[in-house]
Amino acid sequence: LRPPRVHNSEENTMRALTLKDILNGTFSYKTFFPNWISGQEYLHQSADNNIVLYNIETGQSYTILSNRTMKSVNASNYGLSPDRQFVYLESDYSKLWRYSYTATYYIYDLSNGEFVRGNELPRPIQYLCWSPVGSKLAYVYQNNIYLKQRPGDPPFQITFNGRENKIFNGIPDWVYEEEMLATKYALWWSPNGKFLAYAEFNDTDIPVIAYSYYGDEQYPRTINIPYPKAGAKNPFVRIFIIDTTYPAYVGPQEVPVPAMIASSDYYFSWLTWVTDERVCLQWLKRVQNVSVLSICDFREDWQTWDCPKTQEHIEESRTGWAGGFFVSTPVFSYDAISYYKIFSDKDGYKHIHYIKDTVENAIQITSGKWEAINIFRVTQDSLFYSSNEFEDYPGRRNIYRISIGSYPPSKKCVTCHLRKERCQYYTASFSDYAKYYALVCYGPGIPISTLHDGRTDQEIKILEENKELENALKNIQLPKEEIKKLEVDEITLWYKMILPPQFDRSKKYPLLIQVYGGPCSQSVRSVFAVNWISYLASKEGMVIALVDGRGTAFQGDKLLYAVYRKLGVYEVEDQITAVRKFIEMGFIDEKRIAIWGWSYGGYVSSLALASGTGLFKCGIAVAPVSSWEYYASVYTERFMGLPTKDDNLEHYKNSTVMARAEYFRNVDYLLIHGTADDNVHFQNSAQIAKALVNAQVDFQAMWYSDQNHGLSGLSTNHLYTHMTHFLKQCFSLSD
């Protein structure tokens, strides 16, 4: 649902996008994800900040928590207890890393309309959650886990050894948060709340990254983070489970690690409860090509957890690392022992498999030269998943239903023909037992969220259709977008090209390549966006291209694992190859080609600029990695192995940006980094700058004081303004 193309007579009423539009978020869209609380009910925060409960079947809705109550404690978030007796209100949000934050929590008693007084929660809390049944509370405070049987009860302390930057209970340390769990929590309630499982991370021996935070004081303070870089000592993880009904007698019981995992350095990758007395843990060797899924059972007589070898399932990759970005997690069926899981089939495509006894005897559920992306829900008779099968576009996502109750199983695409032009990239959110579900369409047209019947797939209502956005865009000259592919030497390179509104193939345009290119990433997606590059095309007349080269995801293992142990080679080659193909198309001014990227994209853009091809006039690297020895162990070693002589040290050394300092002499290079980047440390850019200075190569640079990897707030405006000036100067465009 892009605004229709206008005839020339109307063009004078249309305007191009401005940088201000982008920085103000004028054309941002909304999505609607129901906060499901049963099969047919969900909560949603209304525009005026009331928390409203909707019942789909009765069509009724009522406010369970008023905006007045929310405002009384400055709440920015809430959580209803499953017994619907209490709500926690979250305020004083204080961001830590990507997912983690601390907050103050208040418990509101819905039955008497008052806040719970007595035995109030300490502050600030690092994580808090209700049990899945009733109103038990588990929370993490000062790296220790506490339990409350009821909100007004005194807390029971589960762990005692928590220590800042040393021992983390129930929350991940930096590297597990960012690179393994992708959550702020590391504790998991069993389905009925009988048991609580949690991880303990011991960071005692991990080297610490230290950087200055300048603040406003006379002396800067030093931020210290235990951060294992490639090859360094890693966190030591243990998993414990405690009986929450009678927590004191037996205390936390450690879950044993499979012998084949425990024999060398390892990671814990995820925990999935199957029943109250069965749990599934996933482990990964430090060399991340072997993963073990271990199903453990509660032994009541001993009050311990037993993980028999017969319930260990090994997943191994011989061509790369285990899994995609992460090892996939299992979705258990109703028999509580068999499960569905996505992993590579014999042809090297990630597909859904059904595992009943052994992985070797797995039954393949989906197949083809496309990939299953995510399993949303398994019910008694259906399995819902997303894939990029439809019409062979890897950058699309559609939702499918497979009937598993009947044989042979039948497959239906739920979304493929709903709003075919507008919606080609979906995700979904299911209520209990998949009685209802919400579909959230991200594009390529204006995003829309809809509610559907889980049995018939009928659309019940539109939850959010972004009407205001649609109206706002009516007089905007948006760029044209096309997604196509290049076939080069048996490699398919999908690209997205963003073209100026009055694009004319007979003219020549400056080209900007936007690159990310990290392993298992995907940039070429059929999604809606009005962002900086939209502005560059709309107002400044640039052509922007995004190319998914080797190492990117959802097109099979051959493309994905091509970069294994060789980061910084093929990703760069494929961007260069694509640029050459774009030049051949005839509308690119080959004297005005630039490349830019952020994070991994900053690394690739830097290497592309220093490739010596003479293709690029200029480029920008924002917060780039410059040497894989500087980045996190979990991420780096997954793709590169270890930086040791007997492993892959040689390529670690060969793939640095610094090694190519000399090659920057003939390009204009803008290097940008936040000084408080906890993720890709400022060290990376500091080393690039040092190498360029030592090589007497001129370059431009911008640092953002006290900013992290996201360069948020006012820094964002400054950043995009600065990069715009740089590109316009490079392309000789007038200001």
Partner: antibody
Framework: QLQLQESGPGLVKPSETLSLTCTVS??????????WGWIRQPPGKGLEWIGS???????YYNPSLKSRVTISVDTSKNQFSLRLNSVTAADTAVYYC??????????????WGQGTLVTVSS | DIQMTQSPSSLSASVGDRVTITCRAS??????LNWYQQKPGKAPKFLIY???SLQSGVPSRFSGSGSGTDFTLTISSLQPEDFATYYC?????????FGQGTKVEIK
């Protein structure tokens, strides 16, 4: 001062049921800080834990004895009891009742009864 | 079950001697180890909890240390009333298990 006192027959025939009661005085059995346990010691040998009970009735047993043991509690009488059925000569021991502190962890037996010798013999 | 092994099983010592008894668990029990003293015909008496915490009223010549699998009970200067059998006990898991005992006798 807390006191625990075991009572019950000193002689039980093989295959019959051993029954003992522990009476707690000087403190309430209905505390969330304690479990109440039974431990035995065969003549000249070491100590063996039989099981423990919470005032609410929650029990934990030694798996080696679980099929034969029942521990119960009577909060109104401030007592808890042990029943061990199908006894053999191997069950001959001094039987102790004890209080097990559980909060803060770890559990430990801080108060013991003086013990009662139960002989299994026909 | 977690096996608790004490060594030595018996020792002879004189008043004033420093005595050390060790207790080894078959698997890690963190610090969840307790020590008891038992005299003939008497119930065990509780001495130390959590590997190293002295029960109030217990003389300071008794001390405990260790964590994981290896633990020690030390009597810094043996007194006449200390001649008895000493038991370690783990409370990390079920079943609660005791060591076989170490008998401290007069030399």
């Amino acid at each position: 001062q807390l006191q625990l006192q075991e009572s019950g027959p000193g002689l039980v025939k093989p295959s019959e049921t051993l029954s003992l009661t522990c009476t707690v005085s000087g403190g309430s059995i209905s505390s969330s800080t304690y479990y109440w346990g039974w431990i035995r010691q065969p003549p000249g040998k070491g100590l063996e834990w039989i099981g423990s009970i919470f005032y609410s009735g929650n029990t934990y047993y030694n798996p080696s004895l679980k099929s034969r043991v029942t521990i119960s509690v009577d909060t109104s009488k401030n007592q808890f009891s042990l029943r061990l059925n199908s006894v053999t000569a191997a069950d001959t021991a001094v039987y102790y009742c004890a209080r097990e502190i559980i909060e803060p962890r770890p559990g430990y037996f801080d108060y013991w009864g003086q013990g009662t010798l139960v002989t299994v013999s026909s | 079950d977690i096996q608790m092994t004490q060594s030595p099983s018996s020792l002879s010592a004189s008043v004033g001697d420093r005595v050390t008894i060790t207790c080894r668990a078959s698997q890690s029990i963190s610090k969840y180890l307790n020590w008891y003293q038992q005299k003939p015909g008497k119930a065990p008496k509780f001495l130390i909890y959590a590997a190293s915490s002295l029960q109030s009223g217990v003389p300071s010549r008794f001390s405990g240390s260790g964590s994981g699998t290896d633990f020690t009970l030390t009597i810094s200067s043996l007194q006449p009333e200390d001649f008895a059998t000493y038991y370690c006990q783990q409370s990390n898991s079920i079943p609660r298990t005791f060591g076989q005992g170490t008998k401290v006798e007069i030399k």
